[in-house]
């Protein structure tokens, strides 16, 4: 199809080489009440849908994305040629940064209902650059945490080194929906709830004497509880002796509860004490059996394929540890009588 009639938007993605970050393009089909591009059911201002950036199509998931090769070749269907780019409804997600993402991206409705609709398309010229500005060492991360129940803020990474006074007007989106009230480089959240979690996009306009373009950054926000102040506790085994039958297989389970930690490095292991010798048990590995916002329960078994007389003289020790400290529980095997 002829893309000369598409409305054009220029975007800049400046990515940090230090961190993993994502990027999104919205299918900003022109709004029907403002534009002659899309001739379809007119919406009165009261009927404006919640997700403003892509209002051109009635079924917003029904859009097609293409990339325009720089050598003038025909348009390429994004889904077929670019595995690191994912289409989710009318949003294009770039999973990995890199200058190779630079180029022209075109979106249009899949269903062309009238001859006028041929021109109902948007061409987005995306320029991708690595961040070179070393003067701003502490720019906001593309992954930000908000502590549940407290006051927090979400900063626009591309503007976080500017004061609020210097900052240009910012347009914020959360999960693809316009946050019309927010216009500064920081969203302040008075009290954090779990619904504040999501993908936030901040846009601002930059211009020179020739043209203007949108600078965009994507922030993944997660809501978390505060780091635990407690060492893990062992839920099982509770008893320090266990009655067993000689010659039979035995599995002893160690279950421990670990409180939430942002940097989570849980240890749960078994080791065996036999007089002055001690050794670890490397298999099987640990597995998480229950995970909530506040804590995680992890289990690790020790498997004795056949209980021997020697095992009755040994101590089987479950050891659990987090950044606060460690806890142990030892089990002595006792032969079942009768």
């Amino acid at each position: 199809f002829n893309i000369s009639g598409c409305s054009t938007k220029k975007l800049l993605w400046t990515y940090s080489t230090r961190s993993e970050e994502e990027f999104v393009l919205f299918c900003d089909l022109p709004e029907p009440q403002k534009s002659h591009f899309c001739h379809r059911n007119r919406l009165s201002p009261k009927q404006v849908p919640e997700h403003l950036p892509f209002m051109g199509s009635n079924d917003l998931s029904d859009v097609q994305w293409y990339q325009q090769p720089s050598n003038g070749d025909p348009l390429e269907d994004i889904r077929k040629s670019y595995p690191h780019i994912i289409q989710d409804k009318c949003t294009l997600h770039f999973l990995t940064p890199g200058v190779n993402n630079s180029g022209s991206y075109i979106c249009r409705p899949k269903m062309i209902k009238s001859p006028y609709d041929v021109a109902c398309c948007v061409k987005m010229i995306l320029e991708v650059k690595p961040q070179t500005n070393a003067s701003c060492e502490y720019s906001a991360s593309h992954k930000q945490d908000l502590l549940l129940g407290s006051t927090g803020s979400i900063s626009c990474p591309s503007l976080s080194c500017q004061s609020d006074a210097q900052s240009p007007a910012v347009t914020w989106y959360k999960n693809g929906k316009l946050l019309s009230v927010e216009r500064s480089n920081r969203i302040v959240v008075d009290e954090v709830y779990d619904y504040h979690q999501g993908t936030y996009v901040c846009d601002y306009t930059q211009s020179d004497t020739v043209s203007s373009w949108t600078v965009r950054a994507v922030v993944q926000v997660r809501t978390i509880v505060g780091d635990t102040k407690l060492k893990p506790d062992i839920l099982d085994p509770v008893e320090d002796t266990l009655e067993v039958e000689l010659g039979k297989p035995l599995t002893i389970s160690c279950k421990a509860r670990f409180g939430f930690e942002r940097v989570f490095n849980p240890v749960i292991k078994w080791y065996i004490k036999d007089s002055d010798l001690e050794w670890e048990v490397s298999v099987p590995e640990a597995k998480s059996i229950k995970s909530t916002l506040k804590d995680e329960i992890i289990e690790r078994n020790i498997i004795l394929e056949k209980v021997t007389q020697r095992d009755l003289r040994r101590k089987f020790v479950c050891f659990v540890q987090n950044s606060i400290g460690n806890t142990t529980q030892s089990v002595q095997l006792k032969e079942k009588r009768g």
Epitope: K269, E278, E280, S282, E285, I303, E305
Partner: antibody, heavy 115, light 110 residues
Framework: SLEESGGRLVTPGTPLTLTCTVS????????MGWVRQAPGKGLQYIGI?????STYYASWAKGRFTISKTSTTVNLKMTSLTTEDTATYFC?????????????WGPGTLVTVSL | AYDMTQTPASVEVAVGGTVTIKCQAS??????LAWYQQKSGQPPKLLIY???TLASGVPSRFKGSGSGTEFTLTISDLECADAATYYC????????????FGGGTEVVLK
């Protein structure tokens, strides 16, 4: 003591089984494992068979490598071999029944995979 | 999971000197770490297990320390016989790991 055998020159895709012959070690009390080392490179863990016969593998070895044992031997069966599998293969004894701390090692057997 | 990073890759030390080799785990492994010595054309030899316990017959010049994610092997009063490649190995998990060994450190004596 431990001694590996069965290493030889094979073409890609050929299956191969290595044997570790054990003397003076009770395989019903100790874990046994296989570790390999490509020429001029570091050690790479393959997997373990526990004293009771349960097997566990490195993630890259799952499905292509199989460890089994008899009362005096520990075997490593390898399938779909590629040139990347060219290495000296060692068998080793674990400190305990399910331990991957290797306290006794065999001298190794060389497997060369070449076209 | 449990990737092991060993530094330096190579080190040159004088006879009688001391060398320190570091090993870092990508996740906490408590004290589940072993150190091995390997000489050219020979299988590895266990030096230290559970981070600091000397294996049978290993001289006390070899000292292991650390816990969690940071570990160190220190060899003091270096002898010619200590010229070898040293490997750390996590012994916390023997399944679903890419490789339990570090990349190795070559100790060259001058």
């Amino acid at each position: 003591s431990l001694e590996e055998s069965g290493g030889r020159l094979v073409t890609p895709g050929t299956p191969l089984t290595l044997t570790c012959t054990v003397s003076g070690i009770d395989l019903s009390s100790y874990a046994m494992g296989w570790v390999r080392q490509a020429p001029g490179k570091g050690l790479q863990y393959i997997g373990i068979i526990t004293y009771g016969g349960s097997t566990y593998y490195a993630s890259w070895a799952k499905g292509r490598f199989t460890i089994s044992k008899t009362s005096t031997t520990v075997n490593l069966k390898m399938t779909s071999l590629t040139t990347e599998d060219t290495a000296t293969y060692f068998c080793a004894r674990g400190l305990g029944g399910a331990s991957t701390t290797w306290d006794i090692w065999g001298p190794g057997t060389l497997v060369t995979v070449s076209l | 999971a449990y990737d092991m990073t060993q530094t330096p890759a190579s080190v040159e030390v004088a006879v009688g000197g001391t060398v320190t080799i570091k090993c870092q785990a990508s996740e906490s492994i408590s004290v589940n770490l072993a150190w091995y010595q390997q000489k050219s054309g020979q299988p590895p030899k266990l030096l230290i297990y559970l981070a600091s316990t000397l294996a049978s017959g290993v001289p006390s010049r070899f000292k292991g320390s650390g816990s969690g994610t940071e570990f160190t092997l220190t060899i003091s009063d270096l002898e010619c016989a200590d010229a070898a490649t040293y490997y750390c190995q996590q012994t916390y998990s023997g399944s679903n790991v890419e490789n339990s060994f570090g990349g190795g450190t070559e100790v060259v004596l001058k």
